[in-house]
């Protein structure tokens, strides 16, 4: 029961996380700037991975996509790549984990197969979460680095002058959504990996040892108990008494493949 709950919860947490990663990737508010030295109107600029928008105090809002823009920084391209890889891995992980869920029966799929699928999806969720966290962190670092650079960086062109405008910048909402979503996906993946351990116990067959007691020969077989259940053929340690010594193979027992000591 605990295994099923852990697996189900891991799936739900990962699902929420991946939905968050998709949302963060699509959001426009990765970084936000307020334009200070502007004598005309208050300008609020916000930028996403795919487009940049401007909103003025007058209510005017305009967004422009980056598709035609040359010279986008490699860092931005790297962030895009990390987020997309995170989404793709997460989506595949979700697909795999649906079939791996213990509560869903698909044909005669064995528990070992479900365990393997659970582990695979768990690893995918972990990598997906790490990709999202890395992508968001790279962007945040790029933002901080660019704004701590000297604003006295001026250069002249055609007799005119270009300089950096004093702006106040903040991390956009998408960064926080991305961090939280990445964390949730990561946690979900860990939960799936933990659930995998419960789904596939180690199959260890221990050979019983024959003890010869004085007077009566006793074959002593340590019994196993079935994981998470109170049933199975050999749930208690049995002593088998009879007139003569027997080999282990002669002792009647019905071992289960999930029995372990």
């Amino acid at each position: 029961m605990a295994v099923t709950a852990c697996q189900g919860l891991g799936f739900v947490v990962s699902l929420i996380g991946i939905a968050g990663i998709i949302a963060a990737t699509c959001m426009d508010q990765w970084s936000t700037q307020d334009l200070y030295n502007n004598p005309v109107t208050a300008v609020f600029n916000y930028q996403g991975l795919w487009r940049s928008c401007v909103r003025e105090s007058s209510g005017f809002t305009e967004c422009r996509g980056y598709f035609t823009l040359l010279g986008l920084p490699a860092m931005l391209q790297a962030v895009r790549a990390l987020m997309i890889v995170g989404i793709v891995l997460g989506a595949i992980g979700l697909l795999v984990s649906i079939f791996a869920l213990k509560c869903i029966r698909i044909g005669s799929m064995e528990d070992s197969a479900k365990a393997n699928m659970t582990l695979t999806s768990g690893i995918m969720f972990i990598v997906s979460g790490l990709c999202a966290i890395a992508g968001v962190s790279v962007f945040a670092n790029m933002l901080v680095t660019n704004f701590w650079m000297s604003t006295a960086n001026m250069y002249t062109g055609m007799g005119g002058m270009v300089q950096t405008v004093q702006t106040r910048y903040t991390f956009g909402a998408a960064l926080f959504v991305g961090w939280v979503a990445g964390g949730l996906t990561l946690i979900g993946g860990v939960m799936m990996c933990i659930a995998c351990r419960g789904l596939a116990p180690e199959e260890t067959n221990y050979k019983a040892v024959s003890y010869h007691a004085s007077g009566h020969s006793v074959a002593y077989k340590p019994g196993g108990f079935k994981a998470s259940t109170g049933f199975g053929s050999n749930t208690k340690n049995k002593k088998i008494y009879d007139g003569g010594a027997r080999t282990e193979d002669e002792v009647q027992s019905y071992p289960s493949k999930h029995d372990y000591v």
Epitope: N37, E56, E62, T167
Partner: nanobody
């Protein structure tokens, strides 16, 4: 990089009119606000008029009702229609633009080289 080029300056009689133009060129992603500033000999540079991307305008008190600012976003060009010119309007007129550069995630303030307007009889 972004460059601004002003044109339309010259000599005009008091009460006359002139139309200045400012064209932006180069690797432009988006220019948010544009403005005109002027600097008379021996004086500080002062704000004349400004216009936002959305069309909001602002004028210095000394030029209100005489000057009209406009812009064409598609062409990245700004205009200043100057009517009823006075001798105190004589100055170098400089174009200013605040351009968003997504490559550096920063605003760049770009200045033109200026055009001279002389109001004299």
């Amino acid at each position: 990089e972004v460059q601004l080029v002003e044109s339309g300056g010259g000599l005009v009689q008091p009460g006359g009119s002139l139309r200045l133009s400012c064209a932006a060129s180069g690797n432009i992603f988006r220019i948010d606000t544009m403005g005109w500033y002027r600097q008379a000999p021996g004086k500080q540079r002062e704000f004349v008029a400004g216009i936002s991307r959305g069309g909001s305008t602002n004028y210095a008190h000394s030029v209100k009702e005489r000057f009209t600012i406009s812009r064409d976003n598609a062409k990245n060009t700004m205009y200043l229609q100057m009517n009823s010119l006075k001798s105190e309007d004589t100055a170098g007129y400089y174009c200013n633009a605040q351009a968003w550069d997504p490559g550096t995630i920063r605003y760049l303030e770009v200045w033109g080289q200026g055009t001279l307007v002389t109001v004299s009889a």
